[in-house]
Interface confidence: low
Amino acid sequence: SANDWTVDHPQTLFAWEGACIRIPCKYKTPLPKARLDNILLFQNYEFDKATKKFTGTVLYNATKTEKDPESELYLSKQGRVTFLGNRIDNCTLKIHPIRANDSGNLGLRMTAGTERWMEPIHLNVSEKPFQPYIQMPSEIRESQSVTLTCGLNFSCFGYDILLKWFLEDSEITSITSSVTSITSSVTSSIKNVYTESKLTFQPKWTDHGKSVKCQVQHSSKVLSERTVRLDVKYTPKLEIKVNPTEVEKNNSVTMTCRVNSSNPKLRTVAVSWFKDGRPLEDQELEQEQQMSKLILHSVTKDMRGKYRCQASNDIGPGESEEVELTVHYAPEPSRVHIYPSPAEEGQSVELICESLASPSATNYTWYHNRKPIPGDTQEKLRIPKVSPWHAGNYSCLAENRLGHGKIDQEAKLDVHYAPKAVTTVIQSFTPILEGDSVTLVCRYNSSNPDVTSYRWNPQGSGSVLKPGVLRIQKVTWDSMPVSCAACNHKCSWALPVILNVHYAPRDVKVLKVSPASEIRAGQRVLLQCDFAESNPAEVRFFWKKNGSLVQEGRYLSFGSVSPEDSGNYNCMVNNSIGETLSQAWNLQVLYAPRRLRVSISPGDHVMEGKKATLSCESDANPPISQYTWFDSSGQDLHSSGQKLRLEPLEVQHTGSYRCKGTNGIGTGESPPSTLTVYYSPETIGKR
C-alpha cells in the first residue's frame, strides 16, 4: 500500500564460519522527504503481540542525535556489525566476522518519524567454505574456443577470495599456451552477491579426459575446490608409415595408416588415401580394424609425391601428416634454356640444362652444334662474354648414379651484334672531276639481326637512291669525306672515304715580288705566278703579254726593265684537268722624258703675218709636268706649255727652237727645229 516501505537486498546471503557478510541494501520510506531516525538489527526476532514490539538479540541499534547532519552516513560500528548506509536510501550492512550460528533470519527495523518497517534478511552460513560451481558448454571441440566459468555466491570486502584454475594439477595462467584469457569479476548488488572467474581457451585433442579444477583461496590458503573432466570431441588422429620412403623405379612400397585415437569413436574404419592433395583411386588396399594398408606395386616416377590418409567421425575428417615418397630414376630427356636469347655480343649468357632426375643429376655433358664442350660438367653453362661464334645449337646430357638421359631438344643461341667491317665504297669513274656525279655504296661483312637502315655523314650530302646507296650530283672541288653506317639495333660506322675530286688550278693571280715600290726604267723586276690549290698538284706555269705567250715558268724576270716592257701580263697555270688564267696585271715602267722633238704647224716655212704653232712632242711616264722653250740664241721664251704660239709672224722669228720637258723622274731636251718666216708678197711689193 502507499504506507509500505520498499526495501531491496539479496534473497539469501551465503558465507562460512570466520568470513564476513556484506548485505547490499536499498530502501524508500512512504514519505518522500522522511529521514531515518532509528535503525535496529535483530537476530532470531519475534513480534510480541501484547507489547506490539519486536524482541530478540539486538546486533545493532543506532538513533539519530542532534549532531547528525541531514543525510550523513551513520558509520557507526557496534560489535561485529557496521552500518554502511545513510538516512535517505541506503541500508547496507556488514557483519564481520560471521559465525555459523548466524544462519537464519535477521530483522532490520527502521523508523522514520511515525513510519516504521521490519525487513527480514536470510543468511546461510556454513561451518566450512562451500565448493565453487563450474559452468561448461554441453559440447567441447578441439581447437574451438570454449569458456568455463567458476563461481562462488560470496563476496565481502575485507575478506578477499581468489579463484584459480588448474589443468591436471598444473596452474593455468593467461600466458599458458592455448589460453586466450582469464577474467575475474566480483558482483555485489541488491540482487546478487558472487565472485566469478572465466577461463577462455582452445583445447587440444590431447586435453580430452583431463581434469580441470577451480580452487578458492584466501590469504594463499585453499578454502575449497571443484573438479570437472574435459570431454573434448576431436576428429580421428591418424599415423602414417611408408616403407621404404625412397625407392627405385619398378620396386614396390607399402604404406600403413593407423587410427590412433578418435572421440567420438569411428562408426566404420573407412580410410581414404590422398596423393599431392588429390584422392587416390584404383589402388590395392587392405583394411583392418583401426588400420589400412596401401600397396604400390612396380613404382613409377609419377608415384613420387606427398601421401596422406584420412578417416572421419561425427566431428569431421581427420588427416595424417604428409609423408613424401621419393622415387629414384635416371635422368629424363633434357632440354636447354638460354638466358637471354637472343643475346647481345659481349653480354653474359647462361645456359641451363633441364632434366628431371632422382637423385638430381650430378654430371652434365654440354654440346655445341653436336660437338662436346670439354670441361663444363655443371647444370649451368656460363659464357661470360658471348661472341658471334658462340651462336648455334646447344644440347646437354644429364647423368646420375642410375644412368644418363637422352637429348630431347636443342636450344638455339642467337647472338646479336652490330654490323661488322662496314666500308664506304666509291662506285664512280676515277678520277672524280669537279661537277661529276658520284655514287657511294655502304657495305658490311655480317650483321645479326639483318641491317635495317643506313646512315650517311655528312647528312644531306646527297640523295639516297636505295638503302645503302648514296648519289652526290655535281660534286664540288672541296667535297668533305663521306662515311656511312649500317644499322640493325645498333649502328656501325665505316671510316670516312675521301672523294679526291680532281679540278683545274684555282685562284690564279700575279704577284709582284720586286721591287717593293713603283717600277722605274732600268730596275730589276720579278713577277711570280701564284694559285690556291690544284688536284692533281702537278702544274705548269705560262706568261702572256697583251694576249701573246711570252715564256713558261713560275717567275717572269726583267734584268733592266724598259718602257717597252710595259703592258698587260697574264699568268696561266695548268694541270691534267685544265688551265686557269689569272686576271690581267698591268706593268707600268716609269721613265724620264725622252724622244723630245719640236714639230711646227702648219710647216717649217711660214709667211710673215701668219700664225705658227710649235709643239713639244715627247715619250714620258709619268707625262711631262713642265715645259721650257728656247730660241736659237738659247733665250728662255718663258712659255711653260706643251705648245708655243707665234702670231703674227715676223721675219725676225726665223731661227731654231728647242723645248725641254720635266716629269717626276727627270728632264729631256729636244734637238733644234728651224722655223723660216718669209716675206709676204705685199712686203716684197713695197720694196
Partner: antibody
Framework: QVQLQQPGAEIVRPGTSVKLSCKAS????????MNWVKQRPGQGLEWFGA????????RYNQEFKGKATLTVDTSSTTAYMQLSSLTSEDSAVYFC?????????????WGLGTTLTVSS | DIVMTQAAFSNPVTLGTSASISCRSS???????????LYWYLQKPGQSPQLLIY???NLASGVPDRFSSSGSGTDFTLRISRVEAEDVGVYYC?????????FGGGTKLEIK
C-alpha cells in the same frame, strides 16, 4: 658483408685529371662487374660505364667515352675511374656499384659516393 | 639511347595510405625471352641508391612486401601499399635492356 669503400671528397683544378677509387671487400672481386654512376647536385643518375675485373673488359656510355677510363687492380680488389680534362660540368657525386654477370645486371650494392669538386 | 621518363614529384600522400609512382620508357623493355628489364631504385636523403625491384616485378632481398611493381612494355607503376615515414626519398626507374643503361629523372615521394 659486401662493402664498397670510396673516398668522401676530391677537390681538383679545371683542366687536370683525377683518379677515383672504389675498394671492394666481402665478396670475390672478379665474379662481379663494377659500374660507375654520376649524380650532379639535385639531379638524376647517369651510368658512366662498367668493367669486368676478371679480364678488364670495359663497356662505356659513349657520351662519356673520352672523359672516363676504367681500370682495376685485382691484387688490392680496387676499381678506378680516371676523369680527364676536368671542367665544372664534371663536379658531381660519383658512385661505384656492383652488378652480377648475368643479364639481370642490376646494381645490388653501392658505394657511399665520392664528391668531386672542380674549382680554380 | 632508351629514354626513361618520370614526374619530378608524386602526389602528396598521407602516412598509412597507398602511393603510386609512374615511369615510361621510349622503347619496350619486354625482351623476346619474356623478361621485362625494368628496375626500381630508392635513394633516401643523404644515402646511396638501393635496389627495390628487379625485372619489373621481383622484390629485392630485404625489401618489405608493401612495395610492388607492374606494367606493360613501356608503362610501369611502383605501388607502396601503406606508406611509412622511412619510405621518403627519390624513386628512380632504370632499364638495362640496351646499352647504355639509363635511369629516369627520379620522382620525389612527398608526405602530406
Amino acid at each position: 658483408q659486401v662493402q664498397l669503400q670510396q673516398p668522401g671528397a676530391e677537390i681538383v683544378r679545371p683542366g687536370t685529371s683525377v683518379k677515383l677509387s672504389c675498394k671492394a671487400s666481402g665478396y670475390t672481386f672478379t665474379d662481379y662487374w663494377m659500374n660507375w654512376v654520376k649524380q650532379r647536385p639535385g639531379q638524376g643518375l647517369e651510368w658512366f660505364g662498367a668493367i669486368d675485373p676478371s679480364d678488364s673488359y670495359t663497356r662505356y656510355n659513349q657520351e662519356f667515352k673520352g672523359k672516363a677510363t676504367l681500370t682495376v687492380d685485382t691484387s688490392s680488389t680496387t676499381a678506378y675511374m680516371q676523369l680527364s680534362s676536368l671542367t665544372s660540368e664534371d663536379s658531381a657525386v660519383y658512385f661505384c656499384a656492383r652488378s652480377d654477370y648475368t643479364y639481370s645486371f642490376y646494381f645490388d650494392y653501392w658505394g657511399l659516393g665520392t664528391t668531386l669538386t672542380v674549382s680554380s | 639511347d632508351i629514354v626513361m621518363t618520370q614526374a619530378a614529384f608524386s602526389n602528396p600522400v598521407t602516412l598509412g595510405t597507398s602511393a603510386s609512382i609512374s615511369c615510361r620508357s621510349s622503347k619496350s623493355l619486354l625482351h623476346s625471352n619474356g623478361i621485362t628489364y625494368l628496375y626500381w631504385y630508392l635513394q633516401k636523403p643523404g644515402q646511396s641508391p638501393q635496389l627495390l625491384i628487379y625485372q619489373m616485378s621481383n622484390l629485392a632481398s630485404g625489401v618489405p612486401d608493401r612495395f610492388s611493381s607492374s606494367g606493360s612494355g613501356t608503362d610501369f607503376t611502383l605501388r607502396i601499399s601503406r606508406v611509412e615515414a622511412e619510405d621518403v626519398g627519390v624513386y628512380y626507374c632504370a632499364q638495362n635492356l640496351e646499352l647504355p643503361w639509363t635511369f629516369g629523372g627520379g620522382t620525389k615521394l612527398e608526405i602530406k
